[in-house]
């Protein structure tokens, strides 16, 4: 088939890099500068993608493969292929409409992107509190508060009666 | 493919005047926030000025508050900066962009701006 196809197509002897040029009866040309072709065959060639501004280059393009852009400091990519840059903000904070905004009470964010999340409930697992959380860290859980008594162990005696709300000494 | 393409950069005196134009494809223009921000020689990038798509919502950084003006004609898919009583500071390199102060994309070689006498 390929034969076939190349007989009846004289572009599909056209490498990556080249493009089938019809002014020049149907020869393979090199891409021009600052243009590429990825694929065999191509009639024409892509203008290659420029990291300006907002983006700064991580690849250079060269005659078979686009440019790669990445975001100057203080910002990081979005979407596929780095589409957009976005705004970094502090640990601690997230990004609003508004700007950066510090995480609220019992929030987080260990990271210069994305959003403050809650931070972890101990008490759900059945655990407690080892370090207190803060903007920037979640909370550290540790045993649950039973298995912290003094003298604990697989076999726990009754705890002797305390008045509701006092803590154990 | 997206493409936005700044123009209208130069020379001028301290205290002078320009008018920074951009032109924009491959998007629904009248669709999106645009910005215009500015490199100067080995610095970070700078915001200067966010417009809202229907042109309603103008906010300015500190430093071009009462000297630059940014407006949009959805029309002509265009984007403009009047840049009066231009300061030496001012010099840069200006970049037009899809989006907000806090979220953008942009794809023109920019326009250069230089100030001095």
């Known amino acids: 088939f390929e034969r076939t196809r190349s007989l009846q197509d004289p572009c599909s002897n056209c490498p990556a890099g080249t493009f089938c040029d019809n002014n020049r009866n149907q020869i393979c040309s090199p891409c021009p500068p600052n243009s590429f072709s990825s694929a065999g065959g191509q009639r024409t060639c892509d203008i290659c993608r420029q990291c300006k501004g907002v983006f700064r280059t991580r690849k250079e393009c060269s005659s078979t493969s686009n440019a790669e852009c990445d975001c100057t400091p203080g910002f990081h990519c979005l979407g596929a292929g780095c589409s957009m840059c976005e705004q970094d903000c502090k640990q601690g904070q997230e990004l609003t409409k508004k700007g950066c905004k510090d995480c609220c009470f019992g929030t987080f964010n260990d990271q210069k992107r994305g959003i403050c999340r809650p931070w972890t409930n101990c008490s759900l697992d059945g655990k407690s509190v080892l370090v207190n959380g803060t903007k920037e860290r979640d909370v550290v859980c540790g045993p649950s508060p039973a298995d912290l008594s003094p003298g604990a162990s697989s076999v726990t005696p009754p705890a002797p009666a305390r008045e509701p709300g006092h803590s154990p000494q | 493919q997206v493409q936005l393409q700044e123009s209208g950069g130069g020379l001028v005196q301290p205290g002078g005047s320009l008018r920074l134009s951009c032109a924009a494809s491959g998007f629904t223009f009248s669709d999106h926030t645009m910005t215009w921000v500015r490199q100067a020689p080995g610095k970070g990038l700078e915001w200067v000025s966010s417009i809202s798509s229907g042109g309603s919502r103008i906010i300015y950084a500190d430093s071009v508050k009462g000297r630059f003006t940014i407006s949009r004609d959805n029309a002509k898919n265009t984007l403009y900066l009047q840049m009066n009583n231009l300061r030496p500071e001012d010099t840069a390199v200006y970049f037009c962009?899809?989006?907000?102060?806090?979220?953008?994309?942009?794809s023109g070689p920019g326009t250069q701006v230089t100030v001095s006498s």
């Open positions: 962009a899809r989006g907000t102060r806090y979220k953008m994309s942009t």
